[in-house]
């Protein structure tokens, strides 16, 4: 640690005195202290001399000697008082700038330590301090206002009692700045704008911050617009608002508008797009396929996106058949606005019944006219199967009817024993029918197919099974002959086992 000579913590001298402060260290040493006049500095290797042959009250202050090469950063200090009867204060600053809730040091340095008992802090022109001003005093450093508030931004003077009268220092302006968390907050209204040529439009760009020092501007396609600024202060925030009013818009007004605000912390910007159109428009679309297939009993939401300007004058969902004249319940229709010009309309169809298959249309109207978007809803069903024994052209034939959607595939199985369903171990023979006959195939209905299996002799103790399957599921019907005998028997001699 460097050593200062004279080796005293404080030195009191009179104006005009010669002061020599010597600092010695192991390596090179440096003096630091408040910039003030008349000092001469002389360095010689490991010592440095700070001297003046004409000390003034302005030399009052703490002088510190450091050894730059010392890794521990040790230092020594001495406080010099230049005791001037006419000047009790050496004020080191015209202005003190701090952030809110920091301690504000007003550097009024007493030039005579004897005066410490009679010091006080006042506002200029003798006004008392604001209520709740918490402060302390150090003769070496001055007055500290603890946890300074924005409202305490005032001009202050330090007062000392000399010979029964108060002697004031020159004033110090305290500027307490609001802590700026970041760039100003921004709003640009509206977020999107559409107008028909000739209509009026308004775009409002506003920025706010706890500190008044910020700039805001509105630009159109990278060109800064000259707009008068309105300023306000409320909710402890400064607000600056730019309002662009357009009486009759034209195509050149269209494009990108950016609201930009900046302060010492940085810059914020937000943008919106202004579209100018020739006439009203109404567009309907869906992200879904307009042809929908859903399994019976399940639910479906039909969604339509609407893009329109001006706004909608009416809209509704309609069921167009073919099964009944029922209409969708209004409670199942839902409208959500994505933004000013885009809306989503949803029709919820829970637990779909067979009678609810068909066409659903969404209709909307604005000054641009009517538009409609129609969905076709087909229900999927697992196959239903039935088998009968009959004679076709004199031949005994098993006839399988399968009904479902999508169109079912048919497979015949012959297996040993009497069973409700053939398992792998029992299977004797399998026949696939690649092209069953389509009996009925109407829109929104099940598809019914028929498959024939010609059997010369119904084998005793065997089962004939017709299986049908589609993407939804499968169904089957087992046919069990009760007695075997002649090649042909009337159907009523047999038992049908579904």
């Amino acid at each position: 640690i460097p050593v200062i000579e004279p080796s005293v913590p404080e030195l009191v001298v009179k104006p005009g005195a010669t002061v020599t402060l010597r600092c010695v260290g192991n390596g090179s040493v440096e003096w630091d202290g408040p910039p003030s006049p008349h000092w001469t500095l002389y360095s010689d290797g490991s010592s440095s001399i700070l001297s003046t042959n004409n000390a003034t009250f302005q030399n009052t202050g703490t002088y510190r000697c450091t050894e730059p090469g010392d890794p521990l950063g040790g230092s020594a200090a001495i406080h010099l008082y230049v005791k001037d009867p006419a000047r009790p204060w050496n004020v080191l600053a015209q202005e003190v700038v701090v952030f809110e809730d920091q301690d504000a040091l007003l550097p009024c340095l007493l030039t005579d330590p004897v005066l410490e008992a009679g010091v006080s802090l006042v506002r200029v022109r003798g006004r008392p301090l604001m209520r709740h001003t918490n402060y302390s005093f150090s003769p070496w450093h001055g007055f500290t206002i603890h946890r300074a508030k924005f409202i305490q931004s005032q001009d202050y003077q330090c007062s000392a009692l000399m010979g029964g009268r108060k002697v004031m220092s020159i004033s110090i302006r305290l500027k307490v700045q609001k802590v700026i968390p970041g760039p100003p907050a921004l709003t640009l209204v509206p977020a999107e704008l559409v107008r028909i040529r000739g209509e009026a439009a308004q775009i409002v760009c506003s920025a706010s911050s706890v500190d008044v020092n910020f700039d805001v501007f509105l630009q159109h396609n990278n060109t800064k617009l000259a707009i008068p600024q309105q300023s306000d202060f409320h909710n402890n925030r400064y607000q600056k608002v730019l309002t662009l009013n357009l009486d009759q818009v034209d195509f050149q007004h269209a494009g990108n508008y950016s609201c930009v605000a900046s302060n010492v912390q940085g810059k914020h910007s937000t943008s919106m797009f202004f579209r100018v159109v020739e006439s009203a428009y109404l567009n309907l679309s869906s992200e879904q396929n307009l042809i929908q297939e859903v399994t019976v009993g399940e639910g479906l939401n039909l969604k339509v996106m609407v893009e329109a300007y001006p706004g909608l004058q009416g809209f509704n969902w309609t069921y167009l058949g073919p099964f009944s004249d029922h209409q969708p319940e209004p409670k199942l229709a839902n409208a959500t606005t994505k933004d000013t010009y885009r809306h989503t309309f949803t029709l919820s169809l829970p637990r779909l019944k067979p009678s609810e298959a068909g066409r659903y249309s969404f209709l909307a109207r604005n000054p641009g006219g009517w538009r409609a978007l129609t969905f076709e809803l087909t229900l999927r069903y697992p196959p239903e199967v039935s088998v009968i024994w009959t004679f076709i052209n004199g031949s005994g034939t098993l006839l399988c009817a399968a009904s479902g959607y999508p169109q079912p595939n048919v497979t015949w199985l012959q297996c040993s024993g009497h069973t409700d369903r053939c398992d792998e171990a029992q299977v004797l023979q399998v026949w696939d029918d690649p092209y069953p006959e389509v009996l009925s195939q109407e829109p929104f209905h099940k598809v019914t197919v028929q498959s024939l299996l010609t059997v010369e002799t119904l084998e005793h103790n065997q089962t004939y099974e017709c299986r049908a399957h589609n993407s939804v599921g499968s169904g089957s019907w087992a046919f069990i002959p009760i007695s075997a005998g002649a090649h042909t028997h009337p159907p009523d001699e047999f038992l049908f086992t579904p």
Epitope: W39, Q94, A104
Partner: antibody
Framework: QVQLQESGPGLVKPSETLSLTCTVS????????WSWIRQPAGKGLEWIGR???????NYNPSLKSRVTMSVDTSKNQFSLKLTSVTAADTAVYYC???????????WGQGTLVTVSS | QSVLTQPPSASGTPGQRVTISCSGS????????VNWYQQLPGTAPKLLIY???QRPSGVPDRFSGSKSGTSASLAISGLQSEDEADYYC???????????FGGGTKLTVL
Amino acid sequence: QVQLQESGPGLVKPSETLSLTCTVSVGSISSYYWSWIRQPAGKGLEWIGRIYASGSTNYNPSLKSRVTMSVDTSKNQFSLKLTSVTAADTAVYYCARERVGIYFDYWGQGTLVTVSS
Amino acid sequence: QSVLTQPPSASGTPGQRVTISCSGSSSNIGSNTVNWYQQLPGTAPKLLIYSNNQRPSGVPDRFSGSKSGTSASLAISGLQSEDEADYYCAAWDDSLNGPVFGGGTKLTVL
């Protein structure tokens, strides 16, 4: 070795505010005085003002009404604000460390600020 | 208009001794110490002399400073081509309560 680096916009419009920041690296901003000095093209140096780590400031009387300096010890930065700028404020702006005996031992490399519309 | 007065230019040949003057008043040079700065082209000023005649470490002893009354001077002996730069004097000014600079002297090494 103390290092100083000025930063801020290189172009400011007349009547607007010039804002610059000086970042001190390799060394602490505390217990030293820090100054701003400017130099118009082809001209001499002009002291603008100084700030101490506690926020104490002194300004050149010719600029006092337009200058504010502040310090952020947590970021090891100090800053300059000069309001209502004119073309006469176009200059290279330097930040520097000021020592007792009134000398500037460390300087930033300088940043050119042009005032123009 | 600078508070301290310097000649706008000076020149010398390599090896020569050159002196740059700086004139002030009682409120600055007359009562306070003088510092000198060297500014090489396109760079920031660098402290050359402080407290009238003190050299910071790293400054060659070819550079020396002196003060008399309200004037000061910077002498460069054994002039070298790398000494070609602008030189500024500075001092505390009691009326300004801060530092003032000279207008600068452009030194050319011929």
